[in-house]
């Protein structure tokens, strides 16, 4: 629960609690903003972002945005509040523990975005869930 000596604010979002009334702590996300990337035509990629940050707000989740146009490929890694759109899109998969990329319609470029809610989950971006090695069925195939 909220410690009695911690000042409670009239603004409800200032101290975020879980269903049991415990203070909700923020998660860790890769946070390099936009960087050039070599990730292309792969089932999954690592972010190659060396910066892990504590998200500013406890309700924020990790986000990764992969963009490809005629000139370059970029990967964006940030924290973001799933109640708010990002790049004009709703974060539909914010509760997922893994960052599963989904393509979004953007004119003039190929645009994929994912969000997830476990520590540093936007470090490993997955374009094809069926090939993700944390899938128990796939591990079964590998070890048979």
């Amino acid at each position: 629960t909220i410690p009695p000596h911690v000042q409670k604010s009239v603004n409800n979002d200032m101290i975020v609690t879980d269903n049991n009334g415990a203070v909700k702590f923020p998660q860790l996300c890769k946070f390099c903003d936009v960087r050039f990337s070599t990730c292309d035509n792969q089932k999954s990629c690592m972010s190659n972002c060396s910066i892990t940050s504590i998200c500013e707000k406890p309700q924020e989740v990790c986000v990764a945005v992969w963009r490809k146009n005629d000139e370059n490929i970029t990967l964006e890694t940030v924290c973001h509040d799933p109640k708010l759109p990002y790049h004009d899109f709703i974060l539909e998969d914010a509760a997922s523990p893994k960052c599963i990329m989904k393509e979004k319609k953007k004119p003039g470029e190929t645009f994929f975005m994912c969000s997830c809610s476990s520590d540093e989950c936007n470090d490993n971006i997955i374009f094809s869930e069926e090939y993700n090695t944390s899938n128990p069925d796939l591990l079964l195939v590998i070890f048979q």
């Epitope: 879980d18 049991n20 203070v23």
Partner: nanobody, 122 residues
């Protein structure tokens, strides 16, 4: 009984330094994830820094990265926060907190100290 007792706060000029300490007792300090969390007057909680155990990996909020350093001395059951290049916006009550999973997925017990006030002003 779990106890966390912060010390080291005070008045410091902008650009100055302070070192906060948090003395822990009543639990096995060396195995716990520890945090520094601050609350400015009339504002919400800001989660400043985290140190994991084992391994001692450290993490920071963007607002303090490069200026603050979290560390721990498991032999003394003490958590530290070295704060350099202090700014007026760092003025807050600083709490140390510990966090442990309950065993139920996604839920945690947390324990908090009473806090120590840091005032950055000329």
């Amino acid at each position: 009984e779990v106890q966390l007792l912060e010390s080291g706060g005070g008045l410091v000029q902008p650009g100055g330094s302070l070192r906060l300490s948090c003395a822990a007792s009543g639990f096995t300090f060396g195995t716990e994830q520890m945090w520094w969390v601050r609350q400015a007057p009339g504002k919400g909680l800001e989660f400043v820094s985290r140190i994991d155990s084992p391994g001692g990996r450290t993490y920071y909020a963007n607002s303090v990265k490069g200026r603050f350093t979290i560390s721990r001395d498991n032999s003394k059951n003490t958590l530290y926060l070295q704060m350099n290049s202090l700014r007026a916006e760092d003025t807050a009550v600083y709490y140390c907190a510990k966090r442990r999973p309950t065993g139920v997925s996604g839920t945690f017990y947390d324990y908090w100290g009473q806090g120590t006030l840091v005032t950055v002003s000329s």
